[in-house]
């Protein structure tokens, strides 16, 4: 058993039938020493008296609000969790597996530029009783700080029968530095509390792995005389990271029509511009990448070829 | 050239080269993006390698009011890497393919290095840790993380010269 | 599977044109540009423009511009290139190419032998 | 236009050894570049496109790399069938051009 913060405590069970549990002793947070009772949640069943009750936990049904009175008068409470083991793995059962980039992946996160700040998202299908609390460094064995705010519903979607919760949290590290080579991974831990049950997840990353940049900006197209061919141009997106003489993007231009099946030009650039060819109904787009480090594209930016 | 008597490099040259570096080292292995390494003890294995720091003059700022700090750092890290790749984590079994571009990545970094630092000048450069696994999956496992660290390495040192021949170039 | 069959070959005196043929099949032939390649004997391969089928749209390599024309004719899913004023260095095998993609060649027709000569 | 320059014209290599074939852009080409083989008497065939990506049905030992104004084709292992010339294209910008082509020849 463990705090995860003032009186509130998580017990970790191996989950399977018939398992003999956790004793767990409660104390009462009192300087009294006679008369006192126990109960759990909104029960008015007395558990025990004494200063101290002990208890097996082996289900979920032993879980819960356990508060010590005197004479009717609320001495305390102590709100216990159970954070499930089976077959020697914890459940994670309150959060969706994402599968990208791998199996077994509950966070996401993504950063539009060096500067330390990140945002993570996970996807539920559970919309009530349901808390999380973020917690980051950078490393793990000396820890240097990342200040996280709170996770917020960033999305509601429905996938089939199911509906589908979107959270996400913006971290930003204390003391980035865009420049450098990273060399300690970003470590990055999330709580998640359902009802009684208890989970965290863990995703490590550096940010230089997980740069998605934003799409470019200010697409402009500039027919040229006596040709098929029309000219392109655009620009960094804001986020970026500055200079661009320093932080660099690589483009990708393409021309397609709506369908991905159609035949389409496509063309790569390190400049801010290119010539590629227009087809009625076709759109020109744009996306973007880390020039010297292969991370993630950004989305494209798109403008009709009319 | 960057000499330690301070004089410029060729920094269109060296943008070049290490740009043609970045391309190397993302083909000799870019599917390691794809496993998670830091599950089996990164921060112990690459610790030991030269890594481009915050208080190394690698920024624009840095680079600005002087760019030699940075280029003995990016030295000494290519003359690091170049020895990783010489060394038996990749010369030794398993044979890495024939068309791996290991080699092309090796003698692109003696390269750099030499643009950076002429034969008769001489920087401090660090000692090659002894990181000698003895079976053939610890060290591709450890071929995987080097390249890994590599990419993110010549990544710094690609933007360096390519802000550098942008602003520095006389 | 995508194919590209082409006309037989041909013997031109200089000043003449010729018209080579190239016919798809395969695939819905709008949805493939079409390309016309050349190779003088024992030498390199050279661009000489693009058709798209859909619009008819066209580019010509400027050593080309006024003497190519390339044309295609959607209900037989045929491609024609025409070439004016034939001169001995026109001399060379004829390819057409077809793919998704404007900027490379994925799919070879066998080629087409043209002659120029007095 | 754009010029491309392959080296060597010829490369004599024994069977089973590696081959490396460079094609350099007079300007830069970011990886806007792609290689053909073409064996006598026969229309060329698409190798690699935009510098190293492969394509189905191409044999593994073939593989590209490069980018701005330098490329490299590289033959791990070279078998009877790819004693051919190799060329590779541009297609940064119109018009589209070739290298000269390499010849690799049996040593």
């Known amino acids: 058993i463990w705090e995860l913060k003032k009186d509130v405590y998580v017990v970790e069970l191996d989950w399977y039938p018939d398992a003999p549990g956790e004793m767990v002793v409660l104390t009462c947070d009192t300087p009294e020493e006679d008369g006192i009772t126990w109960t759990l949640d909104q029960s008015s069943e007395v558990l025990g008296s004494g200063k101290t009750l002990t208890i097996q936990v082996k289900e979920f049904g032993d879980a819960g609000q356990y508060t010590c009175h005197k004479g009717g008068e609320v001495l305390s409470h102590s709100l216990l969790l159970l954070h499930k083991k089976e077959d020697g793995i914890w459940s994670t059962d309150i959060l969706k597996d994402q599968k990208e980039p791998k199996n077994k992946t509950f966070l996401r996160c993504e950063a539009k530029n060096y500067s330390g700040r990140f945002t993570c998202w996970w996807l539920t299908t559970i919309s009530t009783d349901l808390t999380f609390s973020v917690k980051s460094s950078r490393g793990s064995s000396d820890p240097q700080g990342v200040t996280c705010g709170a996770a917020t519903l960033s999305a509601e979607r429905v996938r089939g029968d199911n509906k589908e919760y979107e959270y996400s949290v913006e971290c930003q590290e204390d003391s980035a530095c865009p420049a450098a080579e990273e060399s300690l991974p970003i470590e990055v831990m999330v709580d998640a509390v359902h009802k009684l049950k208890y989970e965290n997840y863990t995703s490590s990353f550096f940010i230089r792995d997980i740069i998605k940049p934003d799409p470019p900006k200010n697409l402009q197209l500039k027919p040229l005389k006596n040709s098929r061919q029309v000219e392109v141009s655009w620009e960094y997106p804001d986020t970026w990271s500055t200079p661009h003489s320093y932080f660099s993007l690589t483009f990708c231009v393409q021309v397609q029509g709506k369908s991905k099946r159609e035949k389409k030009d496509r063309v790569f650039t390190d400049k801010t511009s290119a010539t590629v060819i227009c087809r009625k109904n076709a759109s020109i787009s744009v996306r973007a990448q880390d020039r010297y480090y292969s991370s993630s594209w950004s989305e494209w930016a798109s403008v009709p070829c009319s | 050239r960057a000499v330690p008597g301070g004089s410029s490099p060729a920094w269109t040259q060296c943008q070049q080269l290490s740009q043609k570096l970045c391309t190397l080292a993302w083909s000799a292995h870019p599917l390691v993006g794809h496993m998670d390494l830091r599950e089996e003890g990164d921060e112990e294995t690459t610790n030991d390698v030269p890594h481009i720091q915050c208080g190394d003059g690698c920024d624009p700022q840095g680079l600005r009011d002087n760019s030699q700090f940075c280029l003995q750092r990016i030295h000494q890290g290519l003359i690091f890497y170049e020895k990783l790749l010489g060394s038996d984590i990749f010369t030794g079994e398993p044979s890495l393919l024939p068309d791996s571009p290991v080699g092309q990545l090796h003698a692109s970094l003696l390269g750099l290095s030499q643009l950076l630092q002429p034969e008769g000048h001489h920087w401090e450069t660090q000692q090659i840790p002894s990181l000698s696994p003895s079976q053939p999956w610890q060290r591709l496992l450890l071929r995987f993380k080097i390249l890994r660290s590599l990419q993110a390495f010549v990544a710094v040192a690609a933007r360096v010269f390519a802000h550098g021949a942008a602003t520095l170039s006389p | 599977q995508v194919q590209l069959v082409q006309s037989g070959a041909e013997v031109k005196k200089p000043g003449a044109s010729v018209k080579v043929s190239c016919k798809a099949s395969?695939?819905?032939?709008?949805?493939?540009?079409l390309h016309w390649v050349r190779q003088a004997p024992g030498q390199g391969l050279e661009w000489m423009g693009w058709i798209d089928p859909e619009n008819g749209d066209t580019e010509y390599a400027p050593k080309f511009q006024g003497r190519v024309t390339m044309t295609t004719d959607t209900s037989t899913s045929t491609a024609y290139m025409e070439l004016r004023s034939l001169r001995s260095d026109d001399t060379a095998v004829y390819y057409c190419n077809a793919n998704k993609e404007l900027r490379y060649f994925d799919v070879w027709g066998q080629g087409t032998m043209v002659t120029v000569s007095s | 236009e754009i010029v491309m320059t392959q080296s060597p014209a010829t490369l004599s290599v024994s069977p089973g050894e590696r081959a490396t074939l460079s094609c350099r852009a007079s300007?830069?080409?970011?990886?806007?570049l792609h290689w053909y083989q073409q064996k006598p008497g026969q229309a060329p065939r698409l190798l690699i496109y935009f510098a190293s990506q492969s394509i189905s049905g191409i044999p593994a030992r073939f593989s590209g790399s490069g980018s701005g104004t330098e490329f490299t084709l590289t033959i791990s292992s070279l078998q009877s069938e790819d004693f051919a010339v190799h060329y590779c294209q541009q297609s940064n910008s119109f018009p589209l051009t070739f290298g000269g082509g390499t010849k690799v020849e049996i040593k």
């Open positions: 395969g695939y819905t032939f709008t949805d493939y540009y």
């Open positions: 300007q830069s080409i970011s990886i806007n």
